[in-house]
Interface confidence: medium
C-alpha cells in the first residue's frame, strides 16, 4: 500500500481549520465523501460524511466538523471550529464506500493544536492543482478577536507550498479562486 | 415557521414560456442543507419533481423536463423561480415550490415545507 | 430513473381500521424513503422521513418500516381525518422519484 506523506498544520485553541480537497469529478461525483480521524493504532473515526444523493452540493453539520461539498467544482471543503488540544492528530478527506477501503483525497493533516500564544497563524488548506491533488497552506496572522479563517483572507499572506509544487506566493484575497484545472 | 408562496399567471398560452416565482419567509433561502424545489401535480395525477436549485446556484432538473427547464434564484429577495419552455396542454398542473431538506440528524432529504399550489392552464 | 411503485392504488376503509400502504423501489434505495399525505385542495404533507421516523406534529398512529426495495406506511387506527392519498417518495438519487398515490376512501 501506498503511504502518504502527511502535512502538518500548528493551531492555537479556538481557531478554525479549514482544509479544501479536491476530488475527480470524472470518478467521484457520485460518491459518499467523509473526513476521518486516525487514531494510533485502531480503525480510522469516520467524523462527518456527505449525504444523498451525492451529486448534489451540499453542506452537513456535524459538531465542530463541517463537510461542505461542491460536485460542479470538484471540490470537498472541512471546516473545524474551536480547536482543543485533544483535536490534535492525524485526519483525512476520503471517498468513503464500506464495507470498502476508503480513497484517500490526499496527504494526511497531521494537526497540532497547542495553548499558544495569540501571535500565530491560521491555516487554510487550498489545493493548485488537480494533477497531484496535493494541498498548499496559506496562512493568515491571528488576532484574539478573529478567531475564524474566512473566504477572504487578509493581506498580506504567506504561502508555504508542497514539495515540488514551485509555488511561491500567492494574493490572499485570490486565494479562493486559485484554477484546479484537470 | 418556514412558509413559501407561489406566484405568477394562471392562464399560459401553447409555445410561450411559463413563469413562477416561489417567495419564501420565516427562514433565509441562503441556509445551507435546503435545496429549493418545483414539483407539480397534473390534474387528478401523482407528483412529478421539476428539479431544485441551491442558494449558491447550482440546480438540477429532471431528465424529462430538462430541455425546457430554467430555475434561478434571487437570495437578495428571498424567492426563486421557475421558467418553462414551449408550453403545451400537458404542462397544465398544480405547481408547488417546496423545501427539500437535509438538516443533520435526518438521514434522508424530504420535502418538509411546501407552498399552497398555484394551477397553470396552457390554453390559447 | 429509480421507479417507485405504490400498493393498491386505492382501498376502501372504515374509521378504527388498520390500514396498510406499500411502496416497491426499483432498486435498493436503504431507507431513503418518506411518505406524504395529500388532501384534495392541499399541498402535500410530510409524514414519515427516512423510512420510518415520524415527522414533528404527526400523529403516532402513523408509522413506517421497510429498507431496501419494500417499505410500508401503516395508519394503527384510521381516523376521519385520515382519509386522503398517501404518496412514497425516494431521495436515493436524484431525480427525486414518487409513488403513484394510494387513495384512502371512506367505506
Known amino acids: 500500500a501506498i503511504v502518504l506523506e502527511e502535512e502538518r498544520y500548528d493551531l492555537v485553541e479556538g481557531q478554525t481549520l479549514t482544509v479544501k480537497c479536491p476530488f475527480n469529478i470524472m470518478k467521484y461525483a457520485n460518491s459518499q465523501k467523509a473526513w476521518q480521524r486516525l487514531p494510533d493504532g485502531k480503525e480510522p473515526l469516520t467524523l462527518v460524511v456527505t449525504q444523498r444523493p451525492f451529486t448534489r452540493p451540499s453542506e452537513v453539520h456535524m459538531g465542530k466538523f463541517t463537510l461542505k461539498h461542491d460536485p460542479s467544482e470538484a471540490m470537498l471543503q472541512v471546516q473545524m471550529t474551536d480547536l482543543q488540544v485533544t483535536d490534535s492528530g492525524l485526519y483525512r478527506c476520503v471517498i468513503y464506500h464500506p464495507p470498502n477501503d476508503p480513497v484517500v483525497l490526499f496527504h494526511p493533516v497531521r494537526l497540532v493544536v497547542t495553548k499558544g500564544s495569540s501571535d500565530v497563524f491560521t491555516p487554510v488548506i487550498i489545493p493548485i492543482t488537480r494533477l497531484t491533488e496535493r494541498p498548499i497552506l496559506i496562512t493568515t496572522k491571528y488576532s484574539p478577536s478573529d478567531t475564524t479563517t474566512t473566504r477572504s483572507l487578509p493581506k498580506p499572506t504567506a504561502v508555504v507550498s508542497s514539495p515540488g509544487l514551485g509555488v511561491t506566493i500567492i494574493n490572499g484575497t485570490d486565494a479562493d479562486s486559485v484554477s484546479t484545472s484537470s | 415557521q418556514v412558509q413559501l408562496q407561489e406566484s405568477g399567471p394562471g392562464l399560459v398560452k401553447p409555445s410561450q414560456t411559463l413563469s413562477l416565482t416561489c417567495t419564501v419567509s420565516?427562514?433565509?433561502?441562503?441556509?445551507?442543507?435546503?435545496?429549493w424545489s418545483w414539483i407539480r401535480q397534473h390534474p387528478g395525477k401523482g407528483l412529478e419533481w421539476i428539479g431544485y436549485?441551491?442558494?449558491?446556484?447550482?440546480?438540477y432538473y429532471n431528465p424529462s423536463l430538462k430541455s425546457r427547464v430554467t430555475i434561478s434564484v434571487d437570495t437578495s429577495k428571498n424567492q426563486f423561480s421557475l421558467k418553462l419552455s414551449s408550453v403545451t396542454a400537458a404542462d397544465t398542473a398544480v405547481y408547488y415550490c417546496?423545501?427539500?431538506?437535509?438538516?443533520?440528524?435526518?438521514?434522508?432529504?424530504?420535502?418538509?415545507?411546501w407552498g399552497q399550489g398555484t394551477l397553470v392552464t396552457v390554453s390559447s | 430513473d429509480i421507479q417507485m411503485t405504490q400498493s393498491p392504488s386505492s382501498l376502501s376503509a372504515s374509521v378504527g381500521d388498520r390500514v396498510t400502504i406499500t411502496c416497491r423501489a426499483s432498486q435498493s434505495i436503504s431507507s431513503y424513503l418518506n411518505w406524504y399525505q395529500q388532501k384534495p385542495g392541499k399541498a402535500p404533507k410530510l409524514l414519515i422521513y427516512a423510512a420510518s421516523s415520524l415527522q414533528s406534529g404527526v400523529p403516532s398512529r402513523f408509522s413506517g418500516s421497510g429498507s431496501g426495495t419494500d417499505f410500508t406506511l401503516t395508519i394503527s387506527s384510521l381516523q376521519p381525518e385520515d382519509f386522503a392519498t398517501y404518496y412514497c417518495?425516494?431521495?436515493?438519487?436524484?431525480?427525486?422519484?414518487f409513488g403513484g398515490g394510494t387513495k384512502v376512501e371512506i367505506k
Open positions: 417518495q425516494q431521495s436515493f438519487y436524484d431525480p427525486i422519484t
Open positions: 436549485i441551491y442558494y449558491s446556484g447550482s440546480t
Open positions: 420565516g427562514g433565509s433561502i441562503s441556509s445551507g442543507g435546503y435545496y
Open positions: 417546496a423545501r427539500d431538506s437535509s438538516i443533520a440528524g435526518r438521514a434522508t432529504l424530504s420535502f418538509d415545507y
